[in-house]
Amino acid sequence: APVPPGEDSKDVAAPHRQPLTSSERIDKQIRYILDGISALRKETCNKSNMCESSKEALAENNLNLPKMAEKDGCFQSGFNEETCLVKIITGLLEFEVYLEYLQNRFESSEEQARAVQMSTKVLIQFLQKKAKNLDAITTPDPTTNASLLTKLQAQNQWLQDMTTHLILRSFKEFLQSSLRALRQM
């Protein structure tokens, strides 16, 4: 697994270096998570032909994965910093149950899956410190999440492989959109 931000040897060897700003730390954290997702996607694609699945087939799912929309204020047109930040944090909180689902889905990248999950928790904490309007952030219901997790784990193996692929793809897209938006803040 790649070394989490702030723990690489360069940081240790250069204590006189300027500490990272809040925005730089968030940027670095997201890029670290994206690297982890790439490694997980590699294993998924090597294991099965899921990565050749058509967009149409992937669209026919009943997963409610977070997705950026125009109204969220994260795109260049109609950009709204506060609305967008709330959307990013809410979306990441909603992704947490899916990241929990991924934990038993990898054979050779088990640590990588755990690293993505833990780094996302840290990212949420960073962003919550940045947000002014924490009351607008809705936290998913734990009971609903527990039953969703049970349902996902009960699926047949093919569906679980497809679900894994879709979660990774959607999470990557969400983080990339978040990264672009946060760089405008």
């Epitope: 699945s53 009960a154 047949n156």
Partner: antibody
Framework: EVQLQQSGPELVKPGASVKMSCKAS????????MHWVKQKPGQGLEWIGY????????KYNEKFKGKATLTSDKSSSTAYMELSSLTSEDSAVYYC????????????WGQGTSVTVSS | DIVLTQSPASLAVSLGQRATISCRAS??????????MNWFQQKPGQPPKLLIY???NQGSGVPARFRGRGRGTRFRLNIHPMEEDDSAMYFC?????????FGGGTKLEIK
Amino acid sequence: EVQLQQSGPELVKPGASVKMSCKASGYTFTSYVMHWVKQKPGQGLEWIGYINPYNDGTKYNEKFKGKATLTSDKSSSTAYMELSSLTSEDSAVYYCAREGYGNLERDCWGQGTSVTVSS
Amino acid sequence: DIVLTQSPASLAVSLGQRATISCRASESVDGFGISFMNWFQQKPGQPPKLLIYVASNQGSGVPARFRGRGRGTRFRLNIHPMEEDDSAMYFCQQSKEVPWTFGGGTKLEIK
């Protein structure tokens, strides 16, 4: 050709245990989940549970927890089911069935193992 | 658990005619464009024989007169034209998730 060969019929006494086997051939044993299904004489079918031979992960129907134990042996490509504390209610035919994969691979069933519990 | 309701419980059809068996699921058995509904034929003393898998794909060696259709929660097995050898029990089964569940069965006879 995918084949599942199940062990022969069993006549056992109440309170005893029985262990049946399901030998797989024609595919990579560790790549597919193996399910077990019960059918009592003249009745419908009931799912017992499954084992993933890759990591020996199991999932059971609540009703069969404590009754059935699923194991597998990679070296012989064989799945096993042990039934304990047998009663007349356990008299049935038991099938192993390999799970398919999407629309590419269909499920495949064994011929069944008949278990009769009688004193 | 997904409950499968099969109808009718029994059916008598003349040779050469059409037999239609229905199966309704308590929730959708679809996922990523595939319907995980299977149909089995079972004769006395024999194991279930897979006729149709993922709603409409024919099992190996299954005659073309056996046709499956449907998606979501409603599925049908059609047998046409009915032949002597088709007299048996028929079951639907969902393999979308565990526990696998089965319909109550339809006893098909020659009229």
